[in-house]
């Protein structure tokens, strides 16, 4: 039984045109605007593109078994076909400016058409012959042709106003088209060429389609579907009246899906996509970004990429000329997308969403999600803000900053927390990079009004601050090892700059034209960075060879950006972490001559295997407990008394600055201040009795030291002085008597 | 007017090489999909080869696969088929024909043939 | 995959012949027939299912069923006698382009 089907925005109808059982609403459930409209017989589902939802969905023609097959990065997708050889879907989005393929089921999607068009609107396809055709809508609308896998594109109908409709009579050989401009019907052959004109007296035909000797098309101002043979135009029948705005038209019947390709059997024995082209028969496609094996037939992932977010959506990106530049990820309940990073041995996508507070991680095509790091530990009463991360890809860790707590944590790849490894009293770190291969971490410090740019080992230790002038909010960082640089963006001086990674050598590398740099990342020889103000993404040869060249623009709310370059498995495997961590139980890092120590987060003290991290012993309360080492108790006295006495010189770390009625010695000592400049050294470096200016009065003696004392007590063979000089040059011939 | 006319047919030895040319004029070459055609004197007509319109698609008949190369040059409006390794067998009037105003399959459009002689 | 003609058949002038065409590739593919006079190039006369370029009449038509072609000429005039061959698609799936053997037509 032949079927019209026809979408009117909010619902899809179908009219038996042998029955005329008339205008039977199929039940399908959402849809807001329906537009495009397709089938595959042999399954009995219809397909139809929604452009409010912006979404491509299918269902059984009961109704039954409706699912969204295509989700994420369609705008206005308004054109919409079944491949019912190959089993794929195609579409053209006149917001994106883009045609795309994927299998029926929405996997394997590929970006076939990118360049140069302009609106693409309606779409057919050609599939025994391997031909698909469009229409454009844009400032020279036109009808084109390309091969079904995007090559050998050749304009077909130049001189034509907004077609829309288009629909191949595959029995007959010719093209049928609406045109929106003149009000035409009008017909072709494959070429383009032996234009005929179907009809030339309707007010505003729209939708189209053919069925044996008719075709079947929409009026947007009779709001009608009308019927005439399909040569002459004559025999016209009203098949429904009173319809608004119906958007696409189609007749469901087996005549208009037959024919035979390679790509029917076994898909071509393609792995992924089978596609129709001419002569050839067909050729096997891959997934956007994906590559082709020697095989011809079998894909490959990308492994050299970049990645870059928006608020609600990430985002491939590979730097070729025959790929389409970018798509978005099939990864859903994104709400907030604040920091991205990428494990590529995995090949897990790990973000920090910000509005759920979590950090989460993904498969790129969206499978084997999973929350890493939740918004909350309720037993602990500790509520967590993520703002950065960054992957130890050997250590298989994740070091993160968090706005609420102020600390650079450490979580495990599957989720267990390993500690915090940073911590301070007035410490805001925010951007962070690790550096594994050397053992560092880098990270912004937004101290009030003192920002820094510090480093540190993985462990938190051997803390030292870059840089802490010439800044603002140095916002985003990025660091190439194998150049041994280090960049940095700040959003308040709207620069970007670099140094070596030990801080030498900073240099400004631009400083003109940025507004609002949110995300950094090196990528071969250049720098990348995003601009969230201006929505673009622009990168800088480090070579200095090429400058700076923008790479994409228009793309709103963006967040971040990240490099992934191909794994060195070899290269990977002789990082003496990568094996079991380096046999630690926590930190591992690497020492200057390549091999490893063990180390611990800030709440745990390494035992003494030199392996596992252990609770700290208890101390009494007059001792201070050291964080790791051999020694575990020393006096609390000894506590920031400019000595370490902690192997890991814990106890001179974070020591509080003194209070007003206090002196501060050099090593950061409190004394209390009274005892300052009195003559005794305090301070157990002896800072306080340094650059004394003391005025000894008239009955006192001005010891060599500063020193004041009764005059009485010169020479009197007892030693009032602190460094003897009282008894010193008063008896020739003897030595001062000892003091009682 | 619409026509195609090959060129370049000859006796040549067994072993030897000829490169076959087809000129089109009077319509768009560079939207039609191109093949030869071969007929042995006396016999019915052989698909030899055919090339896609962009020149992207190729395929060869299994008896000349390897041994012959089609190209074409579309700013020329001109078809080729280089002949290499010719046999005995090879020996044809060769058209060349255009395809594409309905299919890639339906020749719409032929030459009047180039005799192509391989003979000792 | 092959395509089976007869190699001969003859019709008195103005009766209707019958041209037949067999092979697998015709379940999957339409044929085309070409008419081909000596010394001359082949001249499609029938593509698709029962299409008839400009310029050819409307005595030659074309059929299928099955892995079976026809071309029928209604009426057949004296110019119609010449070989006759049918074509089609490969459906073995190496993109091959198949010619029948050829009929010839002889009109008496």
């Known amino acids: 039984e032949a079927f019209l089907l026809f979408s009117r925005r909010a619902d899809i109808r179908r009219i038996s045109l042998e029955t005329n059982n008339n205008n039977v609403a199929i039940p399908l459930t959402g849809v807001k605007e329906a537009s495009a409209l397709d089938f595959d017989v042999t399954d009995n589902r219809i397909y139809w593109t929604d452009i409010s939802l912006k979404t491509i969905s299918r269902a059984f023609m009961n109704g039954s078994a409706l699912e969204h097959v295509v989700e994420f990065g369609l705008d206005y997708p308004e054109g919409m076909a079944v491949d019912w050889l190959g089993k794929n879907l195609y579409w053209a989005d006149t917001g994106t400016n883009r045609i795309e393929v994927s299998k029926l089921d929405g996997q394997h999607r590929q970006v076939l058409v990118w360049k140069d068009l302009d609106s693409p609107r309606a779409l057919a396809l050609d599939p025994a012959e391997g031909f698909m055709y469009w229409t454009e809508w844009g400032g020279k609308p036109k009808i084109d042709r390309a091969a079904m896998d995007g090559s050998e594109r050749t304009t077909l109908v130049p001189n034509v106003g907004r077609a829309n409709g288009l629909t191949i009579d595959y029995a007959k050989r010719r093209l049928y088209w609406t045109d929106l401009d003149t009000n035409l019907i009008e017909s072709s052959n494959m070429l383009g060429l032996n234009r005929e004109v179907i009809a030339d007296d309707l007010p505003h035909p729209f939708g189209l389609t053919q069925y044996q000797d008719y075709i079947y098309w929409t009026d947007w101002s009779r709001r009608s579907i009308e019927r005439a043979n399909k040569t002459s135009g004559q025999n016209r029948t009203i098949i429904q009246g009173h319809l608004d705005y119906v958007m696409d038209i189609l007749v469901f019947h087996s005549s208009r899906q037959s024919g035979w390709n390679e790509c029917a059997s076994s898909n071509g024995h393609c792995s992924h996509l089978c596609l129709a082209v001419p002569v050839g028969g067909f050729v096997c496609g891959c997934p956007a970004h994906y590559s082709l094996n020697a095989d011809n037939r079998t894909c490959s992932a990308p492994t050299t990429f970049l990645l870059f977010s928006q608020k609600s959506a990430i985002n491939r990106m590979v730097i070729d000329e025959q790929q389409s530049p970018d798509i978005i990820l099939p990864i859903h309940s994104l709400r907030n997308v604040r920091a991205i990073d990428y494990d590529p041995l995995d090949k897990q996508l790990y973000w920090i969403d910000s509005r759920q507070n979590m950090i989460r991680k993904a498969q790129e095509d969206g499978s084997q999600g999973f929350t890493v790091v939740v918004s909350s530990v309720p037993s602990q009463n500790l509520e967590i803000q993520p703002y950065d991360l960054s992957i130890d890809i050997y250590s298989r860790y994740i070091y993160w900053t968090c706005e609420a707590t102020n600390v650079i944590n450490v979580t495990r790849l599957d989720g267990r927390s390993v500690g915090v490894v940073l911590k301070g009293e007035q410490d805001r770190p925010r951007a962070v990079v690790v550096n594994p291969e050397k053992g560092y971490m880098y990270f912004t410090n937004l101290q009030e009004r003192s920002p820094k740019i510090e480093r540190a080992a993985l462990d938190g230790t051997e803390r030292e601050v870059l840089f802490f002038s010439g800044l603002s909010k140095p916002i985003a960082l990025a660091l190439d090892s194998r150049l041994g640089k280090l960049f940095w963006a700040d959003s308040d001086l709207r620069r970007i700059e670099s140094s070596d990674l030990s801080g030498a050598n900073r240099i400004v590398l631009e400083d003109s034209n940025i507004l609002q740099p949110v995300g950094l990342t090196v990528f071969e020889n250049w720098l990348y960075w995003i601009d969230k103000q201006q929505q673009m993404i622009e990168k800088i040869d480090m070579t200095g060879r090429e400058g700076r060249t923008k790479v994409q623009a228009r793309i709103a709310q963006l967040s971040d950006i990240h490099a992934v370059k191909e794994l060195n498995l070899q290269e990977y495997r002789q990082h003496p972490c990568a094996q079991d961590n380096g046999g630690c139980s926590h930190i591992c890092l690497v020492k200057g001559d390549g091999t490893t120590r063990c180390s611990c987060p800030m709440h745990l003290v390494l035992l003494q295997d030199e392996l596992s991290c252990g609770e700290p012993p208890t101390c009494s309360p007059q001792q201070f407990t050291c964080f790791t080492g051999e020694i575990d108790c020393i006096p609390v006295a000894w506590r920031c008394d400019g000595f370490t006495e902690c192997e890991d010189h814990s106890d001179e770390l974070n020591c509080p600055v003194c209070s007003e009625s206090q002196f501060q010695c050099a090593s950061g000592q409190c004394i209390d201040g009274a005892l300052r400049c009195n003559g005794d050294a305090n301070c157990q470096d002896k800072s306080d009795e340094k650059n004394c200016e003391v005025l000894c009065l008239i009955d006192q003696f001005r010891c060599a030291n500063g020193q004041c004392i009764g005059k009485h007590k010169k020479c009197d063979h007892n030693v009032d002085c602190s460094d003897k000089s009282d008894e010193l040059d008063c008896y020739p011939t003897e030595e001062p008597a000892p003091q009682a | 007017q619409v026509q195609l006319q090959e060129s370049g047919g000859g006796l040549v030895q067994p072993g030897g090489s000829l490169r076959l040319s087809c000129a089109a004029s009077?319509?768009?070459?560079?939207?039609?999909?191109m093949s030869w055609v071969r007929q042995a004197p006396g016999k019915g007509l052989e698909w030899v080869s055919s090339?896609?319109?962009?020149?992207?698609?190729?395929s060869y008949a299994d008896s000349v696969k390897g041994r012959f190369t089609i190209s074409r040059d579309n700013a020329k409006n001109s078809l080729y088929l280089q002949m290499n390794s010719l046999r005995v067998d090879d020996t044809a009037v060769y058209y060349c024909?255009?395809?594409?105003?309905?299919?890639?399959?339906?020749?719409?459009?032929w030459g009047r043939g180039t005799l192509v002689t391989v003979s000792s | 995959s092959e395509l089976t003609q007869d190699p001969a058949v003859s019709v008195a002038l103005g009766q209707t012949v019958r041209i037949t065409c067999q092979g697998d590739?015709?379940?999957?593919?339409?044929a085309s027939w070409y008419q081909q006079k000596p010394g001359q190039a082949p001249v499609v006369v029938i593509y698709?299912?029962?299409n008839r370029p400009s310029g050819i009449p409307d005595r030659f038509s074309g059929s299928s069923s099955g892995n079976s072609a026809s071309l029928t000429i209604t009426g057949a005039q004296a110019e119609d006698e010449a070989d006759y061959y049918c074509s089609s698609r490969d459906s073995r799936g190496n993109h091959l382009a198949l010619f029948g053997g050829g009929t010839k037509l002889t009109v008496l």
């Open positions: 024909a255009a395809a594409g105003g309905a299919s890639n399959w339906y020749f719409d459009l």
């Open positions: 009077g319509f768009t070459f560079s939207s039609y999909a």
């Open positions: 698709g299912e029962n």
């Open positions: 590739s015709l379940r999957s593919f339409d």
């Open positions: 090339i896609s319109s962009g020149s992207t698609y190729i």
